[in-house]
């Protein structure tokens, strides 16, 4: 669809005569008839196949035709067509004299014709005007013409329909050749597909408008590259959607079992050391001066027997005070005023004088200690037990009671954590300095390989009645482990017994 436009510019008929040579009375009141038709090698009369148009009286004898496209659209003349422009045409322009006001062909005498021109040729669609001038013996006509496409039609032949739009069906404008030019943020054949936020994950994200990034179920974040843990997960994360991989110190299917009570609850008071000893279980090792399960009770400061050489201890508000026996002084009765002459060494200790007899030192036999050999040796004072083992005096000897996971005389040997096969689903166990690590086979994850991760035959939840689904990774098939009271390959048939569910 398009329009052939003809712009009449000037008509010269200086003598004011008709084609017959007869003069017009009083002058030639001139109007034009235009016939547009298909290309003919020799332009002949006949139907105006592409259209026809007439003008009103435009002037008398010789006149210029002003551009009147704004006021009524009579010049340029418009010859619309509703077909593919063929690229060739024939054009007949007739100038007629109007003696009266009726310009219909049947109302005019046949000799009212002033002049007739006929042209033919090629004409491509375009914005540029072709200027032409046709001269006869008595008249001259100057005009220009062009073919342009109608609104929403494009291309060399005005055959390509394109209507710009910005709605559900497309977001585009039209290029001069009729091809679509997508509005910013849209793509696709009809510009219906939004361009998502840059970086939006191709599989996990999508968008319904440009620069958006909406996540598919199980994914989150600005670019939909972070998973969402399982609905029931409490203290865990994920690497694929709906997983529950436990944070440090938590265990169980939904990471709700507290394996690190010490860190999560800090139960030990007064600077005591906390040791985890199982789920929700712990042991507090108290600092001197404290006792109780959580080291919450303060001991009397005298309970640690701070007074030496037989001094007696008295509790005070701000500490304690030692009352020293004769011959001793100092905060803890640690200084002696005796000499070897006073036989100060007990339990067979031998006395050696120092500083010209001003004081002395006792050399104690085995199993005795103290400045006067007055104490039996406590073999546990040197903390010989490693890895938190508890030291016990046993007469002349000592022994270590080891914490779980350790053995040896001094609890110096680490019992393999892997001995109890803690890794599920065929995971490989590795002993570490302070625990173990499981390397999981394909399709499993979690601290103990307890979480199934593969997208497998069980993903479609084929098992009924709360049955547990297992995937055979070698064949990509599933097996349903039926709860009590159900049978069938998918546990779909009740066996007539009341079902029992492990709530």
């Amino acid at each position: 669809s398009g329009v052939f436009q003809l712009q009449l510019q000037e008509f010269i008929n200086e003598r004011g005569v008709l084609a017959s040579g007869r003069p017009c009375e009083p002058g030639c009141r001139t109007f034009f008839r235009v016939c547009l038709k298909h290309f003919q090698a020799v332009v002949s009369p006949g139907p105006c196949t592409f259209g026809t148009v007439s003008t009103p009286v435009l002037g008398t004898n010789s006149f210029a035709v002003r551009d009147d496209s704004s006021g009524g659209g009579r010049n340029p003349l418009q010859l619309p067509f509703n077909f593919t422009w063929p690229g060739t045409f024939s054009l007949i322009i007739e100038a007629w004299h109007a003696p009266g006001d009726d310009l219909r062909p049947e109302a005019l005498p046949p000799d009212a014709l002033i002049s007739k021109i006929a042209i033919q040729g090629s004409l491509a669609v375009g914005q540029n005007w072709l200027l032409d001038e046709q001269t006869s013996t008595l008249t001259r006509l100057r005009y220009s013409y062009r073919v342009i496409c109608s609104d929403n039609y494009y291309g060399d032949n005005c055959s390509r329909l394109c209507k710009k739009r910005n709605d559900h069906f497309g977001h585009y404008v039209c290029q001069p050749d009729g091809n679509l030019s997508c509005l910013p943020g849209w793509t696709g054949e009809y510009c219906q597909q939004p361009i998502c936020l840059s970086g939006c994950h191709e599989q996990n994200g999508y968008c319904s408008k440009p620069a958006e990034c909406l996540c598919r179920p199980g994914w989150q974040g600005r670019l939909c590259n972070e998973c969402i843990p399982h609905n029931g997960c409490r203290h865990g994360t994920c690497s694929t959607p709906w997983q529950c991989t436990c944070d440090e110190g938590w265990g169980g299917l939904f990471c709700d079992q507290d394996l690190n009570y010490c860190t999560h609850h800090s139960p030990c008071k007064n600077g005591a050391t906390c040791s985890n000893s199982g789920q929700r279980s712990y042991t507090c090792t108290c600092r001197p001066g404290y006792t109780g399960v959580d080291c919450e009770l303060e001991l009397s400061e005298c309970d640690s027997n701070p007074c030496r050489n037989g001094g007696s201890c008295k509790d005070q508000e701000d500490g304690y005070h030692c009352l020293c026996p004769p011959g001793y002084y100092g905060l803890h009765c640690e200084h002696s005023t005796l000499s070897c002459a006073d036989s100060p060494c007990f339990n067979g200790g031998s006395c050696r004088e120092r500083n010209q007899g001003a004081n002395y030192a006792c050399e104690c036999p085995p199993n005795f200690t103290g400045s006067n050999c007055e104490k039996k040796v406590d073999r546990c004072t040197s903390n010989p037990c490693a890895n938190g083992g508890q030291c016990l005096n046993r007469g002349p000897s000592r022994m270590c009671r080891c914490r779980p996971g350790f053995t040896g005389t001094y609890c110096e040997l680490h019992v393999s954590d892997c001995a109890r096969n803690p890794c599920a689903h065929g995971g490989t166990c590795h002993d570490l300095e302070n625990g173990l690590m499981c390397t999981c086979p394909a399709g499993f994850s979690g601290r103990r390989c307890e979480v199934r991760t593969s997208i497998d035959a069980c993903a479609s939840s084929p098992c009924f009645n709360r049955a547990t689904c297992y995937t055979d990774l070698s064949t990509d098939t599933f097996v349903c482990n039926c709860p009590y009271g159900f049978v069938g390959s998918r546990c779909e048939f009740p066996v007539g017994l009341p079902p029992s569910f492990p709530w």
Partner: antibody, heavy 118, light 107 residues
Amino acid sequence: EVQLVESGGGLVQPGGSLRLSCAASGFTFSNFPMAWVRQAPGKGLEWVATISSSDGTTYYRDSVKGRFTISRDNSKSTLYLQMNSLRAEDTAVYYCSRGYYNSPFAYWGQGTLVTVSS
Amino acid sequence: DIQMTQSPSSLSASVGDRVTITCRASEDIYSNLAWYQQKPGKAPKLLIYDTNNLADGVPSRFSGSGSGTDFTLTISSLQPEDFATYYCQQYNNYPPTFGQGTKLEIK
């Protein structure tokens, strides 16, 4: 035990503001996306806003966009909803919930009533 | 936005009855559907997710089925504590949307 406790609701005039809080416990708050869901008196449930756990990305229903702001403080295990330019149609019980716009809402708080009226 | 339509809007039944509530989505939501139970003055509680998975601690008398656009919640044998309002919710498309609710009352 998972617990979500909302606070901050009350009576406010149209055009006014309120800030709702939700204190979370019993789970590692920073690991999970959170949401606000509301329920007008005698009506059904309506999702309001969501915030991711990973990077704090936020999403809102069209009717509250530009007026409401969802945020979180992982160090305090607390979720917030700042509500400005309140309208009568915002009157509802507001529930804090654990979930995203593309996952079920697994846990819910007891709700806090917001009444917008002159 | 996806419209979720529940039927019936209300339902009377007796203890021990088998009850079915349906939920229809205006377009395909695959299996991304959840069911919630809400009692007067209380918060909703997740019953079922991904169409047919029971949430932690939910009794086995509750079950879900369906896919695409048509879904069902079934209570095999009503207990006194089951009288409540039930909502379905889709989380396949943004934004998430809920059904209008089905009120289950004692006959």
